[in-house]
Amino acid sequence: AWELTILHTNDVHSRLEQTSEDSSKCVNASRCMGGVARLFTKVQQIRRAEPNVLLLDAGDQYQGTIWFTVYKGAEVAHFMNALRYDAMALGNHEFDNGVEGLIEPLLKEAKFPILSANIKAKGPLASQISGLYLPYKVLPVGDEVVGIVGYTSKETPFLSNPGTNLVFEDEITALQPEVDKLKTLNVNKIIALGHSGFEMDKLIAQKVRGVDVVVGGHSNTFLYTGNPPSKEVPAGKYPFIVTSDDGRKVPVVQAYAFGKYLGYLKIEFDERGNVISSHGNPILLNSSIPEDPSIKADINKWRIKLDNYSTQELGKTIVYLDGSSQSCRFRECNMGNLICDAMINNNLRHTDEMFWNHVSMCILNGGGIRSPIDERNNGTITWENLAAVLPFGGTFDLVQLKGSTLKKAFEHSVHRYGQSTGEFLQVGGIHVVYDLSRKPGDRVVKLDVLCTKCRVPSYDPLKMDEVYKVILPNFLANGGDGFQMIKDELLRHDSGDQDINVVSTYISKMKVIYPAVEGRIKFSTGSH
């Protein structure tokens, strides 16, 4: 028998520095977690103690904090190189700055192979990107070799900016021939490493003949055997065992997100490459694990540029940006409109001639808007200003919801109106009318939504049975502020870009902004 230790991360999302327990900015260092300096300590400790170790990343290193905004992926390559990752799969967020924003900072600088079998380049890009990412890699480990095949969510064109010269194929269809090639090469230990979410990970384990282990990402799935060490609730045991169509037991793993845990899986193979046993658990990277001094020093050196950036002007406002709770928790506020417009703008993807865009709607809990921005400071808007408006380090995500769920969400928005509660929704691509004289749960009297399958966008009544795409904060997608119906009834959820980054990019693009209150949210006569 031959034993392999797989160490894995996924959806790190730019958390290079240690974070608080909820993966936001570290405040009390003695209680902080994660970060590459701490990760390195643990990885090195395992490498010294065990003979056959692979360190793998399942994608979405890009996007999530000011680190990515400033360094644009150079930080990912630098610190992943320093940690000596063995391989990485491409995630959807690796395309957030377009293909060039992937090629130059990461693909050309990474010292480890970057993988995806289901992304095929065409046209002029094919020769430019050739060899910079690969469908599979054969990694020598000890006296054996391990095959790694990569995959990436085929929804990436709707979630990011890969351009028109990359084709995202069905994962299973693309993986099988590459696994077959590895088998032909007499590589009999094969890991599928990728970024399509836990449901697809399980399907790959079931359907792709020859895959021995699946290491996934995208869905931020937390798996754990025994008593979990922090706040995350396990979606299943670690590893999650799938019985393949040809009768094999295939371990599937994921390690939550944000570098909070290091996935740790031990696999025992027989001489023919069959999995005999698999066991492990994610390791919580808490403050009991010291940060490596040399990596930490490097982090501090790179940090300097971030502090300078946060005070630079992004753009100007010529109007007061009303982000006060007195406005945003009671009525349409222009800060809410600005943020929603930025959210939609960030999701412009012309992937189908029938649609002017794949999504037109935004909802945003008023309680998530934490500060106004005064225009009487020469109109200047800085990252620092936006960090006061959006201090929670969230993301603006894409969900699919039925019209009936949206109607429930808007009823929830005003079910206890007048108490300055955070659930009052700010909107984009939606016209809503409330009648507060009616009883809670029946106060939405008009709900019109902007069409997407149209050449001239216009507002049509919401259809209860239709499925709509909506951009919203991850806080709402996870049921925050009492929006349990969204969490329970959503049909799809893809995590998006860092909230501040979305708004800052929009302001930089627009240069000068003047959002108005324009009648997106109305109250019927006599009730307000």
Epitope: D86, K111, F112, G131, P140, V141, K181, T184, L185
Partner: antibody, heavy 119, light 107 residues
Framework: QVQLQQSGPELVKPGASVRISCKTS????????IYWVKQRPGQGLEWIGW????????KYNEKFKGKATLTADTSSSTAYMQLSSLTSEDSAVYFC????????????WGQGTLVTVSA | DIVMTQSHRFLSTSVGDRVSITCKAS??????VAWYQQKPGQSPKLLIY???TRHTGVPDRFTGSGSGTDFTLTISNVQSEDLADYFC?????????FGGGTKLEIK
């Protein structure tokens, strides 16, 4: 573009050792295997072994174990092959090469280094 | 070791002709076969890998076929610059082995 530049010809005495270098450019050295191939004058090709500069693991053709030692220096993106206890049978042109996809054919070759073993 | 046999040490052809170079493996290697062209005093050049995939920049008159034990490199519309040695190679099992080569001569 991908390039592999080998060191110049060597004339060595029987029993001695020689080290051939293969300096690479145009790609990330640590991400691809380097293969070594022997060609005797007017003869076919023989695969000697490979090194993976990402972790310095090596694999040898049994026939060349003890004869060839493969190493790599990531700081200079250079691979080396040391040949020891040389005999006239070791007189040959030695090539380094790189693939496009692991193992699947040698796509890029050095220009070759002629080693002549003669008293 | 797997022996790769190229039965013709020499093949003679004319410009514009179609010629097939064959290679037989002593045991099955699926499609783990590459073909190389080598001109005098030069390094080998990869033409085909995975038995039938043409390497970037290789003219489409070069075609590879076969699987298991029998493999063929076909050159249609032979050009004078195709005068060279052609080698097959298997990379299915260690040690990886090459055929003895076939020298293509132009009449």
């Amino acid at each position: 573009q991908v390039q592999l530049q080998q060191s110049g010809p060597e004339l060595v005495k029987p029993g001695a050792s020689v080290r051939i270098s293969c300096k690479t450019s145009g790609y990330t050295f640590t991400r691809y295997y380097i293969y070594w191939v022997k060609q005797r004058p007017g003869q076919g090709l023989e695969w000697i072994g490979w090194i993976y500069p990402g972790n310095f693991n090596t694999k040898y053709n049994e026939k060349f174990k003890g004869k060839a030692t493969l190493t790599a220096d990531t700081s200079s993106s250079t691979a080396y092959m040391q040949l020891s206890s040389l005999t006239s049978e070791d007189s040959a042109v030695y090539f380094c090469a790189r693939d496009v996809y692991d193992y699947a054919g040698f796509a890029y070759w050095g220009q070759g280094t002629l080693v002549t073993v003669s008293a | 070791d797997i022996v790769m046999t190229q039965s013709h040490r020499f093949l003679s052809t004319s410009v514009g002709d179609r010629v097939s170079i064959t290679c037989k493996a002593s045991q099955g290697v699926a499609t783990a076969v590459a073909w190389y062209q080598q001109k005098p005093g030069q390094s080998p050049k990869l033409l085909i890998y995975w038995a039938s995939t043409r390497h970037t920049g290789v003219p489409d008159r070069f075609t590879g076929s076969g699987s298991g034990t029998d493999f063929t490199l076909t050159i249609s519309n032979v050009q004078s610059e195709d005068l060279a040695d052609y080698f097959c190679q298997q990379y299915s099992s260690y040690p990886w082995t090459f055929g003895g080569g076939t020298k293509l001569e132009i009449k």
